[in-house]
């Protein structure tokens, strides 16, 4: 959570002299309450906008907009405090609009905007606009708050922002997964234009359950430049467990910009359709071997094998 460094924010408009200042989120009117305070903001709206930094990077920003109520309290309005709280980390950032001239009623409703709060993909924020001075302790609240959910990097516009591109959002592996037979799964995907390794994480589940019955990890070495953007295929050997038939394949890249924290892509193969009269299963025969505690992935030489090819 930070402020855009360019261009300098502006709050002045026709009929109002105003400047934007950094704020500690604790306006002086908290400490020294005033008798007469303005009413709360009206029609607070927050939208996702995008802005370039001086360096040319593109970031998602919260575009905050609100209007004033058409009452006499605007005569006592000295400014506004804009606060953004990131829900998961409790980090808060504030700015203050400081009015340098008195507001007057005129033919149109006063409207204010601010678009300098840089936000993160897939995060949730509480945006509050507080009119200043803040009310006395038992006074009516003169703020309005709204939640703002930033889309993740799969969102079309977010995909091309700097934070998303850094986490590998432009790579589309176009994964296809095919069951060759009861013991083999073929995975095809498109390599990215970087000489970096990949991992395929296979997790298998019983038909209607969410507890895994088989896990396997397969390492794919870094492709050569001539293999960039080519299809790679891997054949994974499954553990032959009856009913362990729903397979989730996740491909984890290790791009230099995001290392072990890159966006992953996955595909799932459902269990085959069950016949109307299923074969009887002997009583008390477990569907898979129960494993306690650890859910560590098996690596290549442990109960699962695989091989891969790059297609030119």
């Amino acid at each position: 959570l930070r402020l855009l460094d360019f261009p300098a924010p502006v709050c002045a408009q026709e009929g109002l002299s105003c400047r934007v200042k950094n704020s500690t989120c604790l306006d002086d009117s908290w400490i020294h309450p005033r008798n007469l305070t303005p009413s709360s903001p009206k029609d607070l709206q927050i939208q996702l906008h995008f802005a370039h930094t001086q360096q040319g990077d593109l970031f998602p920003v919260a575009h905050i907009e609100w209007t004033l109520q058409t009452d006499a309290s605007i005569l006592y309005l000295e400014g506004a405090e804009l606060s953004v709280l990131q829900l998961n980390t409790n980090e808060r950032l504030c700015v203050r609009f400081e009015f340098l001239s008195k507001l007057r009623h005129h033919h149109r409703r006063w409207r204010f905007t601010f678009s300098h709060f840089v936000v993160d993909p897939d995060q949730e924020y509480e945006v509050t606009v507080h009119h200043l001075p803040k009310p006395i302790p038992d006074g009516d609240p003169n703020h309005q708050s709204k939640n703002f959910l930033v889309p993740d990097c799969e969102h079309a516009r977010m995909k091309v922002t700097t934070p998303c591109m850094s986490s590998g959002s432009l790579w589309d592996p176009n994964i296809t997964v095919e069951t060759l037979d009861t013991q083999h799964l073929r995975v095809d995907f498109t390599l990215w234009n970087e000489s970096t390794h990949y991992q395929i994480l296979l997790t298998s589940f019983p038909h209607m359950e969410n507890h895994s019955c088989f896990e396997h990890m397969h390492h794919i070495p870094a492709p050569r430049p001539e293999e960039f953007h080519q299809r790679s295929n891997v054949t994974l050997t499954l553990r032959n467990l009856k009913g362990c038939c729903r397979h989730q394949v996740q491909i984890q890249p290790f791009f230099s910009s995001c290392l072990n924290d890159c966006l992953r892509h996955s595909a799932t193969v459902s269990c085959p359709e069950m016949p109307d009269t299923p074969e009887p299963i002997p009583d008390y025969m477990p569907l898979w071997e129960p494993r306690s505690g650890s859910s560590d992935y098996k690596d290549d030489d442990d109960k699962g094998s695989s091989h891969h090819h790059h297609h030119h």
Epitope: L26, N88, T89, E91, R92, D122, E126, T128, S145, N147
Partner: antibody, heavy 118, light 107 residues
């Protein structure tokens, strides 16, 4: 001293209701989101709910959605959890917890015990 | 929803041993991970947040590492007062799920 004190726990029959309270002191309560976390006897921690500083964001664990309601009164420095349609599996120690700036929860209450039993 | 798993579920080690607990998220959570210590009959205490930042007042023998899906809590030299259950918690987005816990005791 930063402090959270829970109250309102007790014994209730399945289907009954309880309202838990958490009194905060020693910090600017209205600046913080707040959480409820519970722990069933002999079990691990389970996150229950969060409410943002101005109550505009509220989330619940799937296990309590539709039955529990989190709320707060910043003027009273208080956090609440209204629990309806209580079940045996809601038996637990309930903690209120304040998030740390940067992540995690750094201030916890001592907990209040809720027992659901017929 | 993202699932959190911890391993081992329990461990016994000698005083002075190096102890490692792992936590895995079923999807990437960046570095939005916290570790807690809970002693019997007490409330949990925050040890580490942002995957590797030591909470103020926590002994330096505790450290955290990892990013994405795989995280580690390490106690460099186990002390008798470290007997407790350790939980990881993800906080990238609600629900802020905890791992099932790892019980640590002294041999």
């Amino acid at each position: 001293e930063v402090q959270l004190v829970e109250s309102g726990g007790g014994s209730v029959q399945p289907g009954g209701s309880l309202r838990l309270s958490c009194a905060a002191s020693g910090f600017t309560f209205s600046s913080y989101s707040m959480n409820w976390v519970r722990q069933a006897p002999g079990k691990g921690l389970e996150w229950v709910s969060i409410i943002s500083s101005r109550s505009s964001i509220i989330h619940y664990a799937d296990s309590v959605k539709g039955r529990f309601t989190i709320s707060r009164d910043n003027a009273k420095n208080s956090l609440y959890l209204q629990m309806n349609s209580l079940r045996d599996e809601d038996t637990a120690v309930y903690y209120c917890a304040r998030p740390k700036v940067g992540g995690g929860m750094d201030v916890w209450g001592q907990g209040t015990t809720v027992t659901v039993s017929s | 929803d993202i699932q959190m798993t911890q391993s081992p579920s329990s461990l016994s080690a000698s005083v002075g041993d190096r102890v490692t607990i792992t936590c895995r998220a079923s999807q990437g959570i960046s570095n939005y991970l916290a570790w807690y210590q809970q002693k019997p009959g007490k409330f949990p205490e925050l040890l580490i947040y942002a995957a590797s930042t030591l909470q103020s007042g926590v002994p330096s023998r505790f450290s955290g590492s990892g990013s994405g899906t795989d995280f580690t809590l390490t106690i460099s030299s186990l002390q008798p007062e470290d007997v407790a259950t350790y939980y990881c918690q993800k906080y990238n987005r609600a629900p802020f799920t905890f791992g099932p816990g790892t019980k640590v005791d002294i041999k």
